[in-house]
Interface confidence: medium
């Protein structure tokens, strides 16, 4: 319990002008009503339009965040970085605004975005090659007869750098799951200029075909199921288009490399899940007893036969009947859909049990959280101490340490007049944050409160992410308070896993003014 201290302040000017300050354009966000008109794609129509580009970027396979990685992979003594090319989704055909991934898609890693459609839908992919060499967009589902009508020769599927091509096809019944199978079925899309080189360079993504009326019109996905696509493969950087460039980057002169040296070859092979090795893939976070669907993919040569195991859990495969399994053998080019009802909260591992693959790092962790584990993290009780609460600035004596739910006194909240302000809480260790309770404050006859805000979070205090949650836009805007005393409880679904959490007011009355409590759970509990 916080002691109620009444802090004296100098005479402050009273601002009776009850204006609302707007600091961001409304169209930047999806305010979380289910208004499909705000979506970058309209899922109501039967044509589902995706804007996807091939984009080059540096990738380290998660080595910089893994405590296990042997630094001898890097000739230069630091974590090596490899140029890759990935499928990146954009908001529209101008290809200027990337659609950054939120918490629900973070697990895709190196993979391209989900392409989802139902039987009888049309899929339209506008593909732009922003890379430095020719690539293509290809799926075995694309009907090249239709493609030929647009004047393209079948299988001459190159798109030169800085060129754009539109692919259009109808989802046929044979591509969909049967009535006995799960609601959606996994396929893949990739580039097939040189299939092996293109995939080793990074171009692959999940394509989901679903039964009719499965996908929520507003969100473009099945909201009753949480989906995770996992691509198990051995990325061989010697087979990448960027091999020479990467070798020069990661091997400082004088660099004496014997191409046939087995150690050298092994240092350029990564036993990865979605492009991450050794338990570093982020985003595998799910609620206990929630229906989880895993799309398991493998590509490559025969060494890419994987034996997939989820520790502590069994999963279900559905063909004509439903089978409970603990292990799934995945073959290259075969994509499998399994479901799970995780009953045990905790941190678990998904791994390939083939000895060499497991030893080389083909595993990652998934977190199953309990929705029952939601308690106040200590803003009101005082468990969160003053030094843990900081802000971009403050108005007079309305300091960040006063931003505690139900705090009383004449000055009893954090307040600021600055535009683009923020308040930050350091929880000292990563926590699961399920929600936030907010409250405004009074000053004489004025009601001060934050009516809308966004949330940012971080594990290290350096790399920040904007919370997107279920929003189909680039971020989630939360509705806050409408008066000085009421409490608004906003839920984070999915929850946030972070050590630092930062609230950014976007709309407010008179001044951004806040008392709050964070609801959550110790990550270890």
């Amino acid at each position: 319990e916080i002691t109620r201290t009444t802090l004296q302040s100098d005479q402050e000017e009273i601002d009776y002008d009850d204006t609302i300050s707007v600091e961001m354009k409304k169209e930047d966000f999806d305010i979380y009503d289910e208004d499909e008109n705000q979506s970058p794609r309209s899922f109501q129509k039967k044509t589902r339009h995706y804007f996807i580009a091939a984009v080059e970027r540096l990738w380290d396979y998660g080595m910089s965040s893994s405590p296990h990685v042997l630094r001898n992979r890097a000739q230069s003594g630091s974590v090596p970085q490899f140029k890759k090319v990935v499928f990146q989704e954009f908001t529209d055909g101008s290809f200027t605004q990337p659609l950054y991934r939120g918490e629900l898609n973070e697990h895709l890693g190196l993979l391209g975005p989900y392409i989802r459609a139902e039987v009888e839908d049309n899929i339209m992919v506008t593909f732009r090659n922003q890379a430095s060499r020719p690539y293509s967009f290809y799926s075995s589902l694309i009907s090249y007869e239709e493609d030929q009508r647009q004047g393209a020769e079948p299988r001459k599927n190159f798109v030169k750098p800085n060129e754009t091509k539109t692919y259009f096809w109808k989802v046929q019944h044979h591509m969909a799951p049967t009535k006995d199978e799960f609601d959606c079925k996994a396929w893949a899309y990739f580039s097939d200029v040189d299939l092996e080189k293109d995939v080793h360079s990074g171009l692959i993504g999940p394509l989901l075909v679903c039964h009719t009326n499965t996908l929520n019109p507003a969100h473009g996905r099945q909201v009753t199921v949480q989906e995770f696509a996992l691509f198990f493969t051995i990325f061989d950087e010697t087979k990448s288009w960027y091999f020479t460039e990467n070798m020069e980057r990661n091997c400082r002169a004088p660099c004496n490399i014997q191409m046939e040296d087995p150690t050298f070859k092994e240092n350029y092979r990564f036993h990865a899940i979605n492009g991450y090795i050794m338990d570093t893939l982020p985003g595998l976070v799910m609620a206990q007893d929630q229906r989880i669907r895993w799309y398991l993919l493998s590509m490559g040569s025969n060494e890419n036969i994987h034996s997939i195991h989820f520790s502590g859990h069994v999963f279900t495969v559905r063909k004509k009947e439903e089978y409970k399994m603990a292990l799934y053998n995945l073959y290259p080019g075969v994509f499998e859909t399994v479901e799970m009802l995780p009953s045990k909260a905790g941190i678990w591992r998904v791994e390939c049990l083939i000895g060499e693959h497991l030893h080389a790092g083909m595993s990652t962790l998934f977190l199953v959280y309990s929705n029952k584990c939601q308690t106040p993290l200590g803003m009101a009780s005082g468990h969160i101490r003053d030094f843990q609460i900081t802000a971009s600035g403050q108005y007079g004596q309305w300091a960040p340490k006063l931003a505690r739910l139900h705090y009383s006194g004449s000055i009893n909240a954090w307040s600021t007049k600055e535009p683009f302000s923020w308040i930050k809480v350091d929880l000292l260790a990563p926590m699961i944050i399920h929600g936030i309770k907010t409250q405004g404050a009074r000053q004489k006859f004025s009601s001060l409160y934050i009516s809308q805000f966004i949330i940012m979070y971080s594990l290290d205090g350096k790399k920040w992410q904007t919370y997107r949650g279920n929003s189909t836009g680039t971020l989630m805007v939360f509705f806050g308070n409408v008066d000085s005393s009421g409490i608004k409880h906003n839920i984070f679904n999915p929850p946030i896993i972070a050590r630092y959490i930062r609230l950014h007011p976007t709309h407010y009355s008179i001044r951004s003014t806040l008392r709050m409590e964070l609801m959550g759970c110790d990550l270890n509990s």
């Epitope: 916080i2 802090l7 101490r385 340490k401 260790a429």
Partner: antibody, heavy 126, light 108 residues
Framework: QVQLLQSAADVKKPGASVKVSCTAS????????IDWVRQATGQGLEWMGW????????GFAQKFKGRLTLTRDTSTSTAYMELRRLESEDTAVYYC???????????????????WGQGTLVTVSS | EIVLTQSPGTLSLSPGERATLSCRAS???????LGWYQQKPGQAPRLLIY???SRATGIPDRFSGSGSGTDFTLTISRLEPEDFAVYYC?????????FGGGTKLEIK
């Protein structure tokens, strides 16, 4: 060097209140929390609560809620612990401790009590 | 609240020997939030280890801490005569902060 000097031993009757002082020197008093911990004779340590000398904010263990008050006087760099409605079970040595938030030093670790007062024995007896 | 159980209650060893003290938590504790204290008769506790394994200022390197989750260990590699005292573990991650019951390290 950092020093925390506590008030002398005190004897109180059940139902009374006791106020223990803790005067800090050798550092900036308002920059560190003060925690209070007690220890009954021959027993282990029991955390009571914390107080921020800068803001006056405090947090308590549920057990002491309603009868524990933590205050401070920044002009004399002194923290106070007042415990009301004393019972014989409150007989103990009461310690104040400077709580160092290691996150200040960049290590990102939470506060631990790195400097302690010498302790004040409070005896509750009729 | 989190209950910390220390074992053994009493440990009898000779100077020069290695001491291993255990602290078990009733639920998982982040290693960032576990400390160890030493207390001699008539004295206030003294911080030895914070964050499960970081030595506090001025603490000799014969003291080391380890562990994670629910099991933590304080090790004194070579006992000196001044090391015989009572040792407490403390968790300071979940309110209320709690201490273990203590391990008395005595001369054999």
């Amino acid at each position: 060097q950092v020093q925390l000097l506590q008030s002398a031993a005190d004897v109180k009757k059940p139902g009374a209140s006791v106020k223990v002082s803790c005067t800090a020197s050798g550092y900036i008093f308002t920059s560190y929390d003060i925690d209070w911990v007690r220890q009954a004779t021959g027993q282990g340590l029991e955390w009571m609560g914390w107080m921020n000398p800068n803001s006056g904010n405090a947090g308590f263990a549920q057990k002491f809620k309603g009868r524990l008050t933590l205050t401070r006087d920044t002009s004399t760099s002194t923290a106070y612990m007042e415990l009301r409605r004393l019972e014989s079970e409150d007989t103990a040595v009461y310690y104040c401790a400077r709580s160092t938030p290691h996150s200040y030093s960049g290590s990102g670790l939470p506060p631990t009590s790195d400097s302690w007062g010498q302790g004040t024995l409070v005896t509750v007896s009729s | 609240e989190i209950v910390l159980t220390q074992s053994p209650g009493t440990l009898s060893l000779s100077p020069g020997e290695r001491a291993t003290l255990s602290c078990r938590a009733s639920q998982s504790v982040s290693s960032s939030f576990l400390g160890w204290y030493q207390q001699k008769p008539g004295q206030a506790p003294r911080l030895l280890i914070y964050g499960a394994s970081s030595r506090a200022t001025g603490i000799p390197d014969r003291f080391s801490g380890s562990g994670s989750g629910t099991d933590f260990t304080l090790t004194i590699s070579r006992l000196e005569p001044e090391d015989f005292a009572v040792y407490y573990c403390q968790q300071y991650g979940i309110s209320p902060l709690t201490f273990g019951g203590g391990t008395k390290l005595e001369i054999k």
